[in-house]
Interface confidence: low
Amino acid sequence: VPGEAEQPAPELVEVEVGSTALLKCGLSQSQGNLSHVDWFSVHKEKRTLIFRVRQGQGQSEPGEYEQRLSLQDRGATLALTQVTPQDERIFLCQGKRPRSQEYRIQLRVYKAPEEPNIQVNPLGIPVNSKEPEEVATCVGRNGYPIPQVIWYKNGRPLKEEKNRVHIQSSQTVESSGLYTLQSILKAQLVKEDKDAQFYCELNYRLPSGNHMKESREVTVPVFYPTEKVWLEVEPVGMLKEGDRVEIRCLADGNPPPHFSISKQNPSTREAEEETTNDNGVLVLEPARKEHSGRYECQGLDLDTMISLLSEPQELLVNYVSDVRVSPAAPERQEGSSLTLTCEAESSQDLEFQWLREETGQVLERGPVLQLHDLKREAGGGYRCVASVPSIPGLNRTQLVNVAIFGPPWMAFKERKVWVKENMVLNLSCEASGHPRPTISWNVNGTASEQDQDPQRVLSTLNVLVTPELLETGVECTASNDLGKNTSILFLELVNLTTLTPDSNTTTGLSTSTASPHTRANSTSTERKLPEPESRG
């Protein structure tokens, strides 16, 4: 009304999007009767009647608020449900009696933005760019009003800085009336920023106060020139022949340069390029002593064509050469002596051991094994082991067979075998000697011979048990250039029902099996009674 004092500031009502705003008409009784009130919304200085109160009863006016308004608090309060950003305006109530007075309410609407989404520039940033490059983009969706964005690097806020840091923010209004904020951080980065953590923070207000949301932290691919290349060898420590060794080039630039690995030819002193795998790694598998030498890496920047050379690295593949034993195939008479000498080369100090092959017993620690007053039992295998004590697993061995001249000797002289008539027996006989003997049997049957080692032979015989065979027994004879020797197998009848399972009269490596004549093509292990004390 003209001439009246300036209107007081409207009452502030703050509410979140989607909730209900309670608009309380603040007219005093002297200013008007609350049972007769008109409610208006004011938008761009234009008043629109939205609700009438008559005799305490409310009635919505047709329009955008028709479905969302209701009276509360005995008519003093107008409730507006499902508040939207478009509802941010002034509402006023006007009392009609005793005279027209109005009360204004400023409705403020808030909506927290969604979690900020940060996207790093996937192409990366070169350190030598002339002006700030796009580092990352931060998007905060569906907030109201527009949130404020702050960028952080390593936990510290970034400020606009001429030619160094530029923050470019823009917003769009969604159909819902909510704002989507997009902020682009542009910066000039340095090499040290390769590990820097960037994130953005959205600051926004709600009726409850000020709030903020942080994005995840991101790192940006930073491209910077290589200043140094070097070689790395895996595994670290002492290498040995047979290991899988990987030699790789490393560089302090990003992206790394194109690598090539060269080995110095020890004869020509020239670097010869080695063939690397698809990852630029030189894999030596298995590593050999020839792989030892001086390696270096060349890094070629394909953009600038600048080439950098690493410090050379000396690679030592430790080895033990083939072990040589002399004499290589010793032959001696009984009663004589023998000195076995073991030799090998290595990149490290060697330790030698002599072992008896058959038993694994250590006979000597050192390269020379002396055997005196040789008996025939001394014949057989001796193994020299050349090892590098400082490198576990680095060893080579050589087996030498000592042959003692002599007539054959048998694994057993005589044996009793329990049999049943008409069974097929599987008999075996073993003999040793030098020269290696051959074995013959005194009965007809199917015999086969196997060389067990240079001095030892095993013969097996399949034979049908007949009355004649029970009478004569079975003899095996071993012979060589120096003599002959015989083993006798006595066959004794037994009733199968009296046999005890798993009893065994076999001595040495001899075995006997029996099966019914009706199954002459198959054999099964014979069950034998215990051998008598006396061997007869």
Epitope: T268, R269, E270, E272, E273, E274, E290
Partner: antibody
Amino acid sequence: EVQLLQSGGGLVQPGGSLRLSCAASGFTFSSYAMSWVRQAPGKGLEWVSAISGSGGSTYYTDSVKGRFTISRDNSKNTLYLQMNSLRAEDTAVYYCAKSHDYGDYAGFDYWGQGTLVTVSS
Amino acid sequence: ILTQDPAVSVALGQTVRITCQGDSLKSYYASWYQQKPGQAPVLVIYGKNNRPSGIPDRFSGSSSGTTASLTITGAQAEDEADYYCHSRDSSGTHLRVFGGGTKLTVL
């Protein structure tokens, strides 16, 4: 395209001398070791001599040591074999050969056309 | 120092293996060369089992102990030639050595 063009062969009397040349093109000559390989008529290949890319190291098979000298002129991209005190058994086709990129572990990937040396009175 | 069979024959389209023996092959792979009459040798296999460009994939190499092998799978008439193995000397010097060569006849 790699090319090795040989010259200098011919007939020479026992005790005489001859110099073989091998002009290289199509690759960085000074980066590669080079060798001479010979083949007597109807016989197999026999490695004779090698020289490092810089020319600083030379190697010979026993039968030619002290009589043959391998050399190279990297400014002219040319390999040489100076043969003195020639013998009848030196009669052969002589080939120059370029070592593989990987070095002589991988053998010789390019060969000259060969030049015949005949030692006869 | 490198030993090869003097001659080997193979029926057209069949597989043939040419072997090379020598102490140096424990430490080094053999290179293999093909030589046709009146021509310079041609490298066909180098290293573990690598073919230079232009060499058909019917050629392959392998090695076990002191023996190296060149295998031609599905031999063609044009494969008839002399084949030489080649290696560094086993003495650890920079010397090289060739095998005596194997004459391959394709029947």
